[in-house]
Amino acid sequence: QVPPQYPPIQSIRVQFTRCENEKGCIITSPSKDETMKVQDNSIIINCDGFYLISLKGYFSEELSLSLYYRKGRGPLFSLSKVTSVDSIGVAYLAFKDKVYFNVTTHSTSYKDIQVNGGELILIHQNPGGFCAY
Amino acid sequence: QVPPQYPPIQSIRVQFTRCENEKGCIITSPSKDETMKVQDNSIIINCDGFYLISLKGYFSEELSLSLYYRKGRGPLFSLSKVTSVDSIGVAYLAFKDKVYFNVTTHSTSYKDIQVNGGELILIHQNPGGFCAY
Amino acid sequence: QVPPQYPPIQSIRVQFTRCENEKGCIITSPSKDETMKVQDNSIIINCDGFYLISLKGYFSEELSLSLYYRKGRGPLFSLSKVTSVDSIGVAYLAFKDKVYFNVTTHSTSYKDIQVNGGELILIHQNPGGFCAY
């Protein structure tokens, strides 16, 4: 008998090369075969459970950046007046959540912020839990 | 044929709203359906393997905080003279280990320390390994 | 019917007690039953996917340390002029990658650097993906 295989784990790596002041960061998924999807600059959560979240990036100017997942809830990450980020976190997310950026710059210029090495990774930690597709 | 499902991963999120000087933090599990259990203010480890550990909290006064798992072993986390914690770690834990806090304050007052956003998450990373229930 | 078991997750914990200036750290795997292998002071990657990486150590002198995975790619970790490291990261690694150290000291002495608590952990986060053995 063939040993059971793991169904694919819900995970995604998105990249971002620019962020818009008072808005968010433009995220793209470089791989076609990710198990999670991007929609309207947000990562769509289909499965309940803990997620490992990794956020990296180097910004062309000082900014304040937050990563949200649900209206009315506090951010997953919140960084104030930084030019880079390299953070890891764990959070419980659920079906219908959407992970998205909010960015504010402190310059009078309202130009886009350029980003090098901008990367956001989400990896589901509770396969076997509830999922809705 | 139905594809195999994942058995539930051993994981738990506990909350703590106060810590006792020279003792530990009072932990409660908000969810009934956690796959790990709390006993005597300790999280009980039933499965051998690596665990992802996330610890967060904001304290009402400066304290030193350690998170232990086994008598005679060094702490999983150790923070000296802090008013907040937001740390992630990986550690190998085994059946019979118990994860618990030790706290020391620097004030002459021996009052309890209040905690906002106190959260400890453990997520097993090696399903398929040895477990004893 | 017996519920399906998880096949073992690709993971490894290696230890290192010394590092050689201008070279790397001498890594050994204390456990015989690791699911990943060490070869020529490198950890061999057989499975594509995200990896959770934990790096810890206390060094007998100040050094700069990088952890690489592929020629011509930037490091997974890079620390400058430190006497200790306690870092966690997430990275996408693939079949044929090799994870290894590079170390530089700032002393005129070219002696080995002693390490206490030197530990590198890799845990695959995408079981079910491509593996080559």
Epitope: - | S66, R73, G74, P75, L76, F77, S78, S80, K81 | T17, R18, K56, Y58, S60, E61, E62, T83, S84, D86, S107, S109, K111, D112, Q114, V115, N116, G117
Partner: antibody, heavy 120, light 106 residues
């Protein structure tokens, strides 16, 4: 000025237990590796145990492994050595020692020592 | 485990050079530290990293290390240098001391 003061030494019976303390001042305790070193009467120095600044890494000489535990309370600027299952050969003066930063874990400052006597 | 070998005792004439040796397998690849301990006192670090002197240690103390031998040299021994001298290295996460050399200044 750096000071290290050991205490807790005593006369104890074989298989007994004892906890030594070392209170330090004059430096930021949590930034430094600490060690215990012992010296049996009329004999040389023997390293006993190492602990990192944050207390997360500990190592021991083979002779005391699983019997002794080194720990520290950075809030109290205090280093500890919990000794159990004591043997007559553990009789010695016990010194705590602070590392010299980034100098190969050389022992820059020592306390005056505390005497532990194990005898029936 | 790693072993450091020192001669138990050594005599030196006042104001003459004294050489105290510490032997170990390929000790030249390790960093050696030296301590002086006078009767009834705690040890004092006198040389670290083979040849570096901490602040306050007289210039007459120097160190060298190569091959299988590390050497502590006192260029002109004084009466106050009469003491026990210990070498120390780290190996495989453990510290090792030599057995010590008692220096008598004649």
């Amino acid at each position: 000025e750096v000071h290290l003061v050991e205490s807790g030494g005593d006369l104890v019976k074989p298989e007994g237990s004892l906890r030594l303390s070392c209170v330090v001042s004059g430096f930021t305790f949590s930034n430094y590796v600490m060690n215990w070193v012992r010296q049996a009467p009329g004999k040389g120095l023997q390293w006993v145990a190492f602990i990192s600044g944050d207390g997360r890494s500990t190592t021991y000489t083979d002779a005391v492994k699983s019997r002794f535990t080194i720990s520290r309370d950075n809030a109290k600027n205090t280093l500890y050595l919990q000794m159990s299952s004591l043997r007559t050969e553990d009789t010695a003066i016990y010194f705590c020692a602070k590392e010299k930063y980034s100098s190969g874990w050389s022992f820059e400052y020592w306390g005056q020592g505390t005497l532990v006597t194990v005898s029936s | 485990s790693y072993v450091l070998t020192q001669l138990p005792s050594k005599n030196v004439t006042l104001k003459q050079p004294a050489h105290i040796t510490c032997g170990g397998d390929n000790i030249g690849s390790k960093s050696v530290h030296w301590y002086q301990q006078k009767l009834g006192q705690a040890p004092v670090l006198i040389i670290y990293y083979d040849s570096s002197r901490p602040t306050g240690i007289p210039e007459r103390f120097s160190g060298a290390n190569s091959g299988n031998t590390a050497t502590l040299t006192i260029s002109g021994a004084l009466a106050e240098d009469e003491a026990d001298y210990y070498c120390q290295v780290w190996d495989s996460s453990a510290s090792v001391f030599g057995g010590g050399t008692h220096l008598t200044v004649l």
